[in-house]
Each structure stands twice: as structure tokens, then as C-alpha cells.
């Protein structure tokens, strides 16, 4: 069975075809939800509105964007906030209400045709029984704007580390790739002895942060080779 591969609590070496799977004890806990589950048509109304935790703008409704609720607040805790109307301050397109975009830090109308290449499309995530109806969870995303591209927050799906915000790297999680925190001093890291020698890592860790390297923990030198614990340590 694949139990040992997907058991996140252990680091195990497995026979082919899957190779070894690294556990993931060194990662920080994501503040925003990593999973969204669709409800059906019947569940599109909200009885009592609650702040909805998010990791990126596309997890919020059409009239919302994802940000920390307090200015300069903990960047780890983000919720869906009401979009900003015309002439309000902004930092990216998604902050502005539909029909507007962020230009020079201000939400302006996107009616002008010259903006077409950069305009945001409204994506409706349809979770009911008819994908052709706009009955679902609306999400906005910037199509081609390099200037206003928002980097992925922790838990966001990514293709490469440059897709992730500062302090995060793009690493494997289950069968996908998400932005995870770069490892801090003292956190467990994965040391690959030879390039290509490691097997499949279902839960990949990020690399150690700046000024740190992945080395055997000093008090683990006596342990057997296989159980040596590596941590991020100062050079």
C-alpha cells in the first residue's frame, strides 16, 4: 500500500516505484486554508456573514480581495475584505471593485479600451450542478499584468519559487506544488547527499533561509547514519 508514502509523520525509504518520501515536520502551519470545498446550488446564500480566511485574492468573492485586516498587521492572517471603490487607494487590481483597476495606486474605471490587455477577467467558480450557470463562487485573477502581479501567499499553488512571496519557496505538497515557508534556524531540513539520489518526496521542505545551511544537528553525530537529523544552522 501507499500508506507509508503518504504518512506525513515519518520519513521513510520505500521500494520502487515510489522511492523515498520525506516527512514534513519542519514546515510552519498555514494560517490561511489550503483547501476550498465547493457547496452546491442550494448553499450559495450566507446566513450570517463571517470573515473568510484566504491565501490569495482568487479565494474571495468578486467584490472582495485577500489581505490582512489591519494595516501592517500579521501577514500570516488574511481574510477576504470588501473591494475598494473608484478613487480609493490600492496596491493591485484585485483590491478594486469590478469595473475598476489599480493605476498608480488609485482604483480607476476600466472602461477605457486601451486597458484590454491588462484587464482582469471575472472567473466564476461554479460549484453547483450546472457549470454553465453563474451560481457559484466568483473569483478574480489578473491575466497578464506583470506590473500588478501578486505573489503567492503560503498555501498558494505555484510552479516555481519566483511565483511565491518573499520568504516562501515552491515545494511539493501531496501531488501538487504550493508556496511554503523558507526554513528558519533550527528547523529540520532535508539534505540530499547526491543529486538525483533521493526518491519521491510527497512533502517537500523548503531550503534553509539566507545565511543558513542544512547540516547534521550537533548532538546527532553519534546516531546511526540513517537517523541523523539535519537542521538549518548558521554558516
Amino acid at each position: 500500500t501507499l500508506n507509508s508514502v503518504l504518512n506525513s509523520n515519518a520519513i521513510k525509504n520505500l521500494p520502487p516505484p515510489l522511492g523515498g518520501a520525506a516527512g514534513h515536520p519542519g514546515s510552519a502551519v498555514s494560517a490561511a486554508p489550503g483547501i476550498l470545498y465547493p457547496g452546491g446550488n442550494k448553499y450559495q446564500t450566507i446566513d450570517n456573514y463571517q470573515p473568510y480566511p484566504c491565501a490569495e485574492d482568487e479565494e474571495c468573492g468578486t467584490d472582495e480581495y485577500c489581505a490582512s485586516p489591519t494595516r501592517g498587521g500579521d501577514a500570516g492572517v488574511q481574510i477576504c475584505l470588501a473591494c475598494r471603490k473608484r478613487r480609493k487607494r490600492c496596491m493591485r487590481h484585485a483590491m478594486c471593485c469590478p469595473g475598476n483597476y489599480c493605476k498608480n495606486g488609485i482604483c480607476v474605471s476600466s472602461d477605457q479600451n486601451h486597458f484590454r490587455g491588462e484587464i482582469e477577467e471575472t472567473i466564476t467558480e461554479s460549484f453547483g450542478n450546472d457549470h454553465s450557470t453563474l451560481d457559484g463562487y466568483s473569483r478574480r485573477t489578473t491575466l497578464s499584468s506583470k506590473m500588478y502581479h501578486t505573489k503567492g501567499q503560503e498555501g498558494s499553488v505555484c510552479l516555481r519559487s519566483s511565483d511565491c512571496a518573499s520568504g516562501l519557496c515552491c515545494a511539493r505538497h501531496f501531488w501538487s506544488k504550493i508556496c511554503k515557508p523558507v526554513l528558519k534556524e533550527g528547523q529540520v531540513c532535508t539534505k540530499h547527499r547526491r543529486k538525483g539520489s533521493h526518491g519521491l518526496e510527497i512533502f517537500q521542505r523548503c531550503y534553509c533561509g539566507e545565511g543558513l545551511s542544512c547540516r547534521i544537528q550537533k548532538d546527532h553525530h553519534q546516531a546511526s547514519n540513517s537517523s541523523r537529523l539535519h537542521t538549518c544552522q548558521r554558516h
Partner: antibody
């Protein structure tokens, strides 16, 4: 529109083959692991197969191992399930599913009958 | 495989009354990333799954707040505070911490 749309289902004789497709749109398909899950008439869901974001790693339920092959074309944002040596017990609605921020398609019915 | 056991298998509820469904997993669903990969979904005849709860207790943003999830480790509960006619169907729990994804047997909820 963020969605998954399955196609390719139909009626097929035992021992024959069928290829299902799942067209993804509205999200970064190439970053997500993708799964196939099926549901036999009147029964619960059964996980069938998974493929990693890059297509390099695949895993199958014991019931389909050696007969089914999962694959993906990230350039076309499409997931596939090649089903060979079909049996009556493979009759089910087949759903493709995105992991993490889970999203399911509407399903496509495969009926294996002589 | 992780066995998911649901109780009861059927439930008949008066509209406006509460309902509670239990789900037990054969092993802990707590991942080292701090998340517990347990979900609840509702299925109606001829329809795909409608997911209600993710990671034990998080409601999908458009799901009414009469639905709530709780639990940890291996014991989980889905509660509907006031059942409505539209809530009928089969409720399933599901885990995805480990392959294969596995599902509870389902709890049929009907209105009295």
C-alpha cells in the same frame, strides 16, 4: 470559468477500452495534483488514480492497477484516464478532481455491458 | 487504507430540529502541516458531491452557518443546527491525508 469537464464516457463491451478526458479551465492546472474518483450506481465514491502536477508520479487503486493509465497534458490543460480490459464492475460515473483546493467535475458515465 | 466509519446510517429529522452525524477514522488525519484532512460533503441523486466542510471545521464560504464541523485526530462530527427541506440527501465524510482517498458509508438524511 474555473471548472473541470469530463468527457469520453459511454457504453462499452467487457474487455474493450475507453479513454476519458477532463478539460480544466480557469486555474493553474500544471500546479495541481489531479485525481480520478468513481461512483458505481447506488454506491459510494471510490478513489481510482492520482497523477502529480508534472505527470512524473502516478498511483492507482488495486482494483484498476495494470488496466488503467492516468496521464495529463499540461499544455492542453487536460487530464486523461485510459481504461483497458474493462469489466462490468468498472461501470460507474467517473469524476476528475483537483486536490488541495478541491474541485470536482460533473462526471461522465461509463457503462460496461455486453 | 484508512477506514472511515459513519454513524448513524440514516436519520429522519423534523424541519427546524438539529441533526448530528459522526465519523471515525482508522487513524489520525492530522498532518504535520497542522491541518487535518477531513471533509464533509452532501450528495443528492444524480448530482456530483457538494462539499460543505473542509479541514474538519471550515465551512465553504457559501455554505449556511447552520452547518458546522468539529473533532480532531480520529473522531469527527457534522452538525446541522436547524434542518431544512433542502438539506436532504446522503452525507459523507472523506479523508485525503493518505492514498487512497477513502469515504464513509454515508448517512441518509430525510425529513419527517
Amino acid at each position: 470559468q474555473v471548472q473541470l469537464v469530463e468527457s469520453g464516457g459511454g457504453v462499452v463491451q467487457p474487455g474493450r477500452s475507453l479513454r476519458l478526458s477532463c478539460a480544466a479551465s480557469g486555474f493553474t492546472f500544471s500546479g495541481y495534483g489531479m485525481h480520478w474518483v468513481r461512483q458505481a450506481p447506488g454506491k459510494g465514491l471510490e478513489w481510482v488514480a492520482v497523477i502529480s502536477y508534472d505527470g512524473n508520479d502516478k498511483y492507482y487503486a488495486d482494483s484498476v492497477k495494470g488496466r488503467f493509465t492516468i496521464s495529463r497534458d499540461n499544455a492542453k490543460n487536460t487530464l486523461y484516464l485510459q481504461m483497458n480490459s474493462l469489466r462490468a464492475e468498472d461501470t460507474a460515473v467517473y469524476y476528475c478532481a483537483r486536490e488541495l483546493r478541491v474541485l470536482w467535475g460533473q462526471g461522465t458515465l461509463v457503462t460496461v455491458s455486453s | 487504507d484508512i477506514v472511515m466509519t459513519q454513524t448513524p446510517l440514516s436519520l429522519s429529522v423534523t424541519p427546524g430540529q438539529p441533526a448530528s452525524i459522526s465519523c471515525k477514522s482508522g487513524q489520525s488525519l492530522l498532518h504535520s502541516d497542522g491541518k487535518t484532512y477531513l471533509y464533509w460533503y452532501l450528495q443528492k441523486p444524480g448530482q456530483p458531491p457538494q462539499f460543505l466542510i473542509y479541514e474538519v471545521s471550515n465551512r465553504f464560504s457559501r455554505v449556511p452557518d447552520r452547518f458546522s464541523g468539529s473533532g480532531s485526530g480520529t473522531d469527527f462530527t457534522l452538525r446541522i443546527s436547524r434542518v431544512e427541506a433542502e438539506d436532504v440527501g446522503i452525507y459523507y465524510c472523506m479523508q485525503s491525508i493518505q492514498l487512497p482517498w477513502t469515504f464513509g458509508q454515508g448517512t441518509q438524511v430525510e425529513i419527517k
